[in-house]
């Protein structure tokens, strides 16, 4: 399958460097509450030969795990193929390398599927500035208001970054 | 829910294009996730391609990428598929579907409302 929104002008390599998770979205909300096994947490990303390359944050045992993961480029630009709890289907859905990244993901584990979506930021400072786009994409794709949960400073391991 | 009835479909020949429509009633249109999928005789039901609330986002099977469209009109409450170079492994019932979110490419489990079907037979 294939989502029609375009990859980052310039490549994914402007992708790389600091992330930080601002919300995610489920329709599923097990998975996106403290301890379910999408509320993970954007540290770095870099990107290499058309795949991309994560860092991510996660909460385990009171302590944040760093953990690195790769979504493998397929024949759709803004489309990735990434193992994490079962498969899923990574679309870039807005990029704005130096601002912002809106992604979501269906995920199948077993014989459940789901929807997943994440907000992240280069500036924290500036989260509340791409909400409203977040909640645009949710939204689109049929995630409702009711099922983002916008992160603290407490949910996103800022004592585990560097 | 929404009720869904498609049209368009024929009897066509291999290369040849077709347009298919499908119109609701209802609920609020603009509120699903619209999909296509087919079935061919002996087959299991596969999806063709979806479209997000808006229209924004469109996503494929790769049997027919670059070769089919989908598109919608909220206004009028329909969503089109055009087929162009059609073969004939394109032969099928397509049906149209109404889903609650964009997981219903991969699982009928966010399926709220199917069309009856329309018939498309490609000879070559």
């Known amino acids: 399958q294939e989502g029609n929104h375009e990859e980052p002008q310039g490549g994914l390599e402007e992708l790389s460097g600091r992330w930080h998770s601002v919300a995610l979205a489920s329709n599923k909300s097990d998975l996106i509450k403290p301890w379910g096994h999408f509320r993970v947490f954007i540290h770095s990303m870099s990107a290499k030969d058309g795949n991309l390359h994560g860092d991510i944050l996660i909460p385990q045992d009171g302590q944040c795990e760093k953990v690195s993961l790769t979504a493998f480029k397929t024949a759709t630009s803004n489309k990735f193929d990434l193992e994490y709890w079962g498969h899923n289907d990574l679309y870039l859905a807005e990029v704005d390398p130096k601002s912002y990244l809106i992604l979501y993901m269906i995920n199948q584990y077993n014989d459940d599927t789901s929807l997943v979506a994440h907000l992240m930021v280069r500036d924290l400072s500036r989260q509340q500035d791409f909400l409203p786009a977040f909640e645009s994409v949710c939204e689109d794709i049929g995630l409702h208001k009711d099922q983002i949960v916008v992160l603290s400073d407490d949910d996103r391991c800022q004592g585990s970054r560097d | 829910q929404v009720q869904l009835v498609e049209s368009g479909g024929g009897l066509v020949q291999a290369g040849d294009s077709l347009r298919l429509s499908c119109a609701a009633s209802g609920r609020s249109f603009s509120n699903y996730v619209m999909n296509w999928f087919r079935q061919a005789p002996g087959k299991e039901r596969e999806f063709v391609a979806a479209i997000s609330r808006s229209g924004r986002s469109t996503f494929y099977a790769d049997s027919v990428k670059g070769r089919f469209t989908i598109s919608r009109d909220n206004p009028k409450a329909t969503v089109y598929l055009q087929m162009n170079s059609l073969v004939i492994e394109d032969t099928a019932v397509y049906f149209c579907?109404?889903?609650?979110?964009?997981?219903?490419?991969?699982?009928?489990?966010?399926?709220?409302?199917w069309g009856q079907g329309t018939q498309v037979i490609v000879s070559s």
């Open positions: 579907a109404a889903a609650s979110d964009i997981t219903s490419m991969r699982s009928l489990a966010a399926i709220t409302s």
